[in-house]
């Protein structure tokens, strides 16, 4: 059945922690992605940004999770108003920013 929101959020946080702790070489060869507004529709916005990174084994599971948590189909090259389109950051920074925000949501009990 569907993953309960609290479980989904916790799993995603654990995966992002795993990425940040195990990072040795530049994550995803230093690939750059669009920064996003960490607000409503965050899972889809994060996916729309990260889906444009290919060949990066470290974030494959994160991409899978975000794809499962986003209710609509997302393809590479697809953009929405949820992006801060004038700002690109490294995947490593994107992951750190996302992780900090998700931890905050988890502490506040905002699971959806």
């Amino acid at each position: 059945g569907p993953v309960p929101p609290s479980t989904a959020l916790r799993e995603l946080i654990e995966e992002l922690v795993n990425i940040t702790q195990n990072q040795k070489a530049p994550l995803c060869n230093g690939s750059m992605v669009w920064s996003i507004n960490l607000t409503a529709g965050m899972y889809c916005a994060a996916l729309e940004s990260l889906i444009n990174v290919s060949g990066c084994s470290a974030i494959e599971k994160t991409q899978r999770m975000l794809s499962g948590f986003c209710p609509h189909k997302v393809s590479a090259g697809q953009f929405s108003s949820l992006h801060v389109r004038d700002t690109k950051i490294e995947v490593a920074q994107f992951v750190k920013d996302l992780l900090l925000h998700l931890k905050k949501l988890f502490r506040e009990g905002q699971f959806n």
Epitope: V3, S54, G55, C56, S57, E60, R64, M65, S67
Partner: antibody
């Protein structure tokens, strides 16, 4: 335009080793993963392994002890090496690129035919 | 390893009719709400060509007469209506778990 092209020895003696090069164009190996797949004559497809853009290598455990996959990003080349060859390793060997998530193989080379025979 | 069993091994379908190919996985290929099952077409003397990804999504440039469905362990590729140029062998493939595996293939003949 995305292209992949395999080049191999054609004929290899039993017990010998095989080296195949996949030369790609139209994309960067730092950003894309490359799979190796083989197909014996008249039979189905078998995944051998892959090398990710970030350098991680995944092998098919059934062949891992005989396989080595590597790449040279600057030359846009991926290499497959296989040792202790047997006659049942006779096949067409393909390299194939993973597309974006969900990482299905969206572009394939034409394949190179390898015959293991004395 | 996840074993993919395709059926039938071969089928002959009249031009303009529907062709249905089944792929059954030995365990679920679903992960976080997606089915990591893909379909390929291989014509004689050519490499495989991606048709469908994530069970039901049509690859760019593939005609709409191809469609995919299914989840967990049971998947179907449908071609409706079949055209002469669809004569080929069709393979399912999963990448939910390593090693990636392919089905044994289904050879489609057009009557």
């Amino acid at each position: 335009e995305v292209q992949l092209k395999e080049s191999g020895p054609g004929l290899v003696a039993p017990g010998g080793s095989l080296s195949i090069t996949c030369t790609v164009s139209g994309f960067s190996l730092t950003d894309s993963s490359i799979n190796w797949v083989r197909q014996p004559p008249g039979k189905g497809l078998e995944w051998l392994g892959m090398i990710w853009g970030d350098g991680r290598i995944d092998y098919n455990d059934a062949l891992k002890s005989r396989l080595s996959i590597s790449k040279d990003n600057s030359k846009s080349q991926v290499f497959l090496e296989m040792n202790s060859l047997r006659t049942d390793d006779t096949a067409t060997y393909y390299c194939a690129r993973d597309g974006y998530f969900p990482y299905a193989m969206d572009f394939w080379g034409q394949g190179t035919s390898v015959t293991v025979s004395s | 390893d996840i074993v993919l069993t395709q059926s039938p091994a071969s089928l002959a379908v009249s031009l303009g009719q529907r062709a249905t190919i089944s792929c059954r996985a030995s365990e679920s290929v679903d992960s976080y709400g997606n089915s990591y099952m893909h379909w390929y077409q291989q014509k004689a003397g050519q490499p495989p060509k991606l048709l469908i990804y994530l069970a039901s999504n049509l690859e760019s440039g593939v005609p709409a007469r191809f469609s995919g469905s299914g989840s967990r362990t049971d998947f179907t590729l449908t071609i409706d209506p079949v055209q002469a140029e669809d004569a080929a062998t069709y393979y399912c493939q999963q990448n939910n778990e390593d090693p990636r595996t392919f089905g044994g293939g289904t050879k489609l003949e057009i009557k």
